[in-house]
C-alpha cells in the first residue's frame, strides 16, 4: 500500500461532547479520493496503544483495535467516498473522553487532525415559553 511521497491532504475535525450511555459522533472530514479502495481511515486515542478504529479498502479492519473500543465503533461507510471520516462511538463511557487523532491516507497523500472529546451526563436545556 503506497502513498504519494510526502504530500499532505487537508483533514478537519470538530471538538465535540458525548452523553454517557448514549451514542456519540467524533467528526472528521478530508479531501475525498476518487476510489474508495485508496482511502484509509485510522482513529487513534491519546494514551491508548491499539487503534480506536480502522477502515480500509472499503471495509472495517479491526485486527489492531484496542479492547476498550471493541464492538463500539463504526464509520459511515457510504459517506467515506465523499470525504466523511466521522466515527460513531456507541454507548459512550466516561473513559472515552480525551484527545483523538483522525489520520487519513489517500492516493493524494496523508493528513491528520486532532480533536478533544468530552464526556458527561449532559441534558438538553429546557425552554419555557
Amino acid at each position: 500500500f503506497g502513498i504519494s511521497g510526502r504530500h499532505s491532504i487537508t483533514v478537519t475535525t470538530v471538538a465535540s461532547a458525548g452523553n454517557i450511555g448514549e451514542d456519540g459522533i467524533l467528526s472528521c472530514t478530508f479531501e475525498p479520493d476518487i476510489k474508495l479502495s485508496d482511502i484509509v481511515i485510522q482513529w487513534l486515542k491519546e494514551g491508548v496503544l491499539g487503534l480506536v478504529h480502522e477502515f480500509k479498502e472499503g471495509k472495517d479492519e479491526l485486527s489492531e483495535q484496542d479492547e476498550m473500543f471493541r464492538g463500539r465503533t463504526a464509520v459511515f461507510a457510504d459517506q467515506v467516498i465523499v470525504g466523511n471520516a466521522s466515527l460513531r462511538l456507541k454507548n459512550v463511557q466516561l473513559t472515552d473522553a480525551g484527545t483523538y487523532k483522525c489520520y487519513i491516507i489517500t492516493s493524494k497523500g496523508k493528513g491528520n487532525a486532532n480533536l478533544e472529546y468530552k464526556t458527561g451526563a449532559f441534558s438538553m436545556p429546557e425552554v419555557n415559553v
Epitope: F1, I3, R6, V40, Q42, L44, K45, E46, G47, V48, L49, G50, E64, D66, E67, M68, T95, T99, K101, Y103, I105, K110
Partner: antibody, heavy 121, light 107 residues
C-alpha cells in the same frame, strides 16, 4: 534531562523470578506509553511488553505471555517488569524505552542503559 | 505478527560512501516505521520515525523513505561514527516487531 534507569537484573535459576524496575525522570511519566525490549547475547532486538500511559492497556510478546507482567507506578515514576517461570532463553539485556508521540504511532525515543538478566543453573 | 525483514544483514563500506539499508514488512504498516542505530554495549538510538522524519539531534546525512511494506534508510556520506548496527521497527501492530538488523562495518 530526560532519563530512564533500569535496575533489578541478575543471575537467576530456571523457573525463578525477577522484578525489573525502570526509574523515569525529566518528563511527564503518565502521558507516555512505555516498553520493555530485550537483546539476547549477540542477537537482535526483541520487543517484550508495552503499557499505555494510564496503565490501562498492556501488551506482551507471545514468548513471554502468561509469565511476564508489566506495570507502572505513576506516584514513583517507575515502570516494572515482573518475570516469572524464567527460562534460559530469557537471558538478555533488558531495556526500558519511552514511546514517542501522543498516540503511540512513532518510535521509541528514550532508552535506558539496560540491565542484564542471566537465567542459568 | 508482522514480520520485518532487513537486507543486507551486513555490509562493508568506506568513509564517504552512500549506504542504503532496506526493510520489508510482511503486510502494510503504512508509515508507522522507525529506524534505530546501536553501537556495541550501548542502548539503541532513534534515528527516523514515521518512516521519513528525522529524530531530534540526528545528522541530516540520515534519511528514511518508503511506505506500506518497503522502506529504506540511507546514509548519504558515511562517517566514522556511523559504523554500527541498524534496526527497523514497526509500530502499526501492537507487537512492535523489529527487523533482524544490518551491521555496517569498515571496509
Amino acid at each position: 534531562e530526560v532519563q530512564l534507569l533500569e535496575s533489578g537484573g541478575g543471575l537467576v535459576q530456571p523457573g525463578g523470578s525477577l522484578r525489573l524496575s525502570c526509574a523515569a525522570s525529566g518528563f511527564t511519566f503518565n502521558t507516555h506509553a512505555m516498553h520493555w525490549v530485550r537483546q539476547a547475547p549477540g542477537k537482535g532486538l526483541e520487543w517484550v511488553s508495552a503499557i499505555s500511559g494510564s496503565g490501562g492497556s498492556t501488551y506482551y510478546a507471545d514468548s513471554v505471555k502468561g509469565r511476564f507482567t508489566i506495570s507502572r507506578d505513576i506516584s514513583k515514576n517507575t515502570l516494572y517488569l515482573q518475570m516469572n517461570s524464567l527460562r534460559a532463553e530469557d537471558t538478555a539485556v533488558y531495556y526500558c524505552a519511552r514511546l514517542l508521540g501522543r498516540f503511540g504511532e512513532y518510535g521509541m525515543d528514550v532508552w535506558g542503559q539496560g540491565t542484564t538478566v542471566t537465567v542459568s543453573s | 505478527d508482522i514480520q520485518m525483514t532487513q537486507s543486507p544483514s551486513s555490509l562493508s563500506a568506506s568513509v564517504g560512501d552512500r549506504v542504503t539499508i532496506t526493510c520489508r514488512a510482511s503486510q502494510t504498516v503504512y508509515t508507522w516505521l522507525a529506524w534505530y542505530q546501536q553501537k556495541p554495549g550501548k542502548a539503541p538510538k532513534l534515528l527516523i520515525y514515521d518512516a521519513t522524519n528525522l529524530a531530534t539531534g540526528v545528522p541530516s546525512r540520515f534519511s528514511g523513505s518508503g511506505s506500506g511494506t518497503d522502506f529504506t534508510l540511507t546514509i548519504s556520506s558515511l562517517q566514522p561514527e556511523d559504523f554500527a548496527t541498524y534496526y527497523c521497527q514497526q509500530s502499526y501492530s501492537t507487537s512492535w516487531t523489529f527487523g533482524g538488523g544490518t551491521k555496517v562495518e569498515i571496509k
